[in-house]
C-alpha cells in the first residue's frame, strides 16, 4: 500500500518568522526508524530545508544548526520552522520515509504554502 502524507494547504508565519504545521502519515508498515524531511519547492527547484530521523516513540532530533524543530506522536509530526523572512515564502513539502526495517516506504505530502510577511520596522521614537 502507498503511504499517504497529509499536511495543511496554507500556513501564515508569525511576525517573528515562525511557522508551524502538522505532518501526518498513514503507515503501511511497522517501521521503527522514520525520516521526516522538509523540502522547499520554488520555481521547479527543490531544496532540503531540514531532516530528522527518529525511532518510533522517541523524540524528533534535528541537527543543532537546523532551522527546524519538531515533536512526534504516533504517526503525527509537529514541525516548526524558524527564522523565516518574506523571501522564504513558498511551498514546503513534508516527505516521510520509513527507513527500517525494510521494506522502505516513501510518502510525499502535497505541500504547505507558507506565507511570510516581514514586520514593519518600528518608527524611531524621540
Amino acid at each position: 500500500k502507498a503511504m499517504h502524507v497529509a499536511q495543511p494547504a496554507v500556513v501564515l508565519a508569525s511576525s517573528r518568522g515562525i511557522a508551524s504545521f502538522v505532518c501526518e502519515y498513514a503507515s503501511p508498515g511497522k517501521a521503527t526508524e522514520v525520516r521526516v524531511t522538509v523540502l522547499r519547492q520554488a520555481d521547479s527547484q527543490v531544496t532540503e530545508v531540514c531532516a530528522a530521523t527518529y525511532m518510533m516513540g522517541n523524540e524528533l532530533t534535528f541537527l543543532d544548526d537546523s532551522i527546524c524543530t519538531g515533536t512526534s506522536s504516533g504517526n503525527q509530526v509537529n514541525l516548526t520552522i524558524q527564522g523565516l523572512r518574506a523571501m522564504d515564502t513558498g511551498l514546503y513539502i513534508c516527505k516521510v520515509e520509513l527507513m527500517y526495517p525494510p521494506p522502505y516506504y516513501l510518502g510525499i505530502g502535497n505541500g504547505t504554502q507558507i506565507y511570510v510577511i516581514d514586520p514593519e520596522p518600528c518608527p524611531d521614537s524621540d
Partner: antibody
Framework: EVQLVESGGGLVQPGGSLRLSCAAS????????IHWVRQAPGKGLEWVAA????????YYADSVKGRFTISADTSKNTAYLQMNSLRAEDTAVYYC????????????WGQGTLVTVSS | DIQMTQSPSSLSASVGDRVTITCRAS??????VAWYQQKPGKAPKLLIY???SLYSGVPSRFSGSRSGTDFTLTISSLQPEDFATYYC?????????FGQGTKVEIK
C-alpha cells in the same frame, strides 16, 4: 557539474567476485541516495541496490540479496557494489545513479560499466 | 513487489505526432513515479519526477499525469530526437521497479 563515474567492471567466471566503484563529484554526497541499476544486453532496466549515504541504510533487490553488498565512503565521495557468487544472469551494464530529494527519482546517472559473467 | 506494467511495448510514430505511453502499478503507490528516456548505448535520462513534474532542462512537450494507479507520459509533438526507449519507475517502496520499456520508432 554533477558527475558519476563507474569503474571496476570486467569479465569474471561464475562464482567469482567483483567490486564496482561509483565516484561522485559536483554535489554534497552525504545528502543523497546512491543507487545501482543494471541492464542486461538487449533488456530493460533493473534496480539492484541503494544506500543512503548520510546514514547508510541499505536496500536490495531480491535477485541479489545475500550476494551483493552496497556501501559508501563519504570521505571519498564514492559508493561501491561488492558482487559475490556471480552468475551468468548478472551479466549486464551496471549504472550508478543519484536519487533526487523529491520523489527519489534518479536525476543523474553514470556512463555505466559492463560486467560479463562467463566461463 | 509492485509491478509496473508499461504499454505499449513499442510504437511507430511520425514527427509531429502526439504519443502517449502508460504505466499501470499493480497496487497503490505514492506519487513517486518517474519517467526516463534512453538511447542505445547511453545511460537513461530523467524526464518526469513525482508523476507530473517536468525535470529541469526537459522540453515542455513532455508531460506526465496520474489517475489512480495509472501513470501516463505524453509527448505532445514528437521530434526527431525523441525516438528512443522510455521507462517508468516507482520509488514508493522497495524494491524499486521499472516498467519493461516502450520503444518509440520512426514510422
Amino acid at each position: 557539474e554533477v558527475q558519476l563515474v563507474e569503474s571496476g567492471g570486467g569479465l569474471v567466471q561464475p562464482g567469482g567476485s567483483l567490486r564496482l566503484s561509483c565516484a561522485a563529484s559536483g554535489f554534497t554526497f552525504s545528502g543523497y541516495w546512491i543507487h545501482w541499476v543494471r541492464q542486461a544486453p538487449g533488456k530493460g532496466l533493473e534496480w539492484v541496490a541503494a544506500i543512503t549515504s548520510r546514514d547508510s541504510y541499505t536496500y536490495y533487490a531480491d535477485s541479489v540479496k545475500g550476494r551483493f553488498t552496497i556501501s559508501a565512503d563519504t570521505s571519498k565521495n564514492t559508493a561501491y557494489l561488492q558482487m559475490n557468487s556471480l552468475r551468468a544472469e548478472d551479466t549486464a551494464v551496471y549504472y550508478c545513479a543519484r536519487g533526487s530529494y523529491l520523489g527519489s527519482a534518479f536525476d543523474y546517472w553514470g556512463q555505466g560499466t559492463l560486467v560479463t559473467v562467463s566461463s | 513487489d509492485i509491478q509496473m506494467t508499461q504499454s505499449p511495448s513499442s510504437l511507430s510514430a511520425s514527427v509531429g505526432d502526439r504519443v502517449t505511453i502508460t504505466c499501470r502499478a499493480s497496487q497503490s503507490v505514492s506519487s513517486a513515479v518517474a519517467w526516463y528516456q534512453q538511447k542505445p548505448g547511453k545511460a537513461p535520462k530523467l524526464l518526469i519526477y513525482s508523476a507530473s513534474s517536468l525535470y529541469s532542462g526537459v522540453p515542455s512537450r513532455f508531460s506526465g499525469s496520474r489517475s489512480g494507479t495509472d501513470f501516463t507520459l505524453t509527448i505532445s509533438s514528437l521530434q526527431p530526437e525523441d525516438f528512443a526507449t522510455y521507462y517508468c519507475q516507482q520509488s514508493s517502496t522497495t524494491p524499486f521497479t521499472f516498467g519493461q520499456g516502450t520503444k518509440v520508432e520512426i514510422k
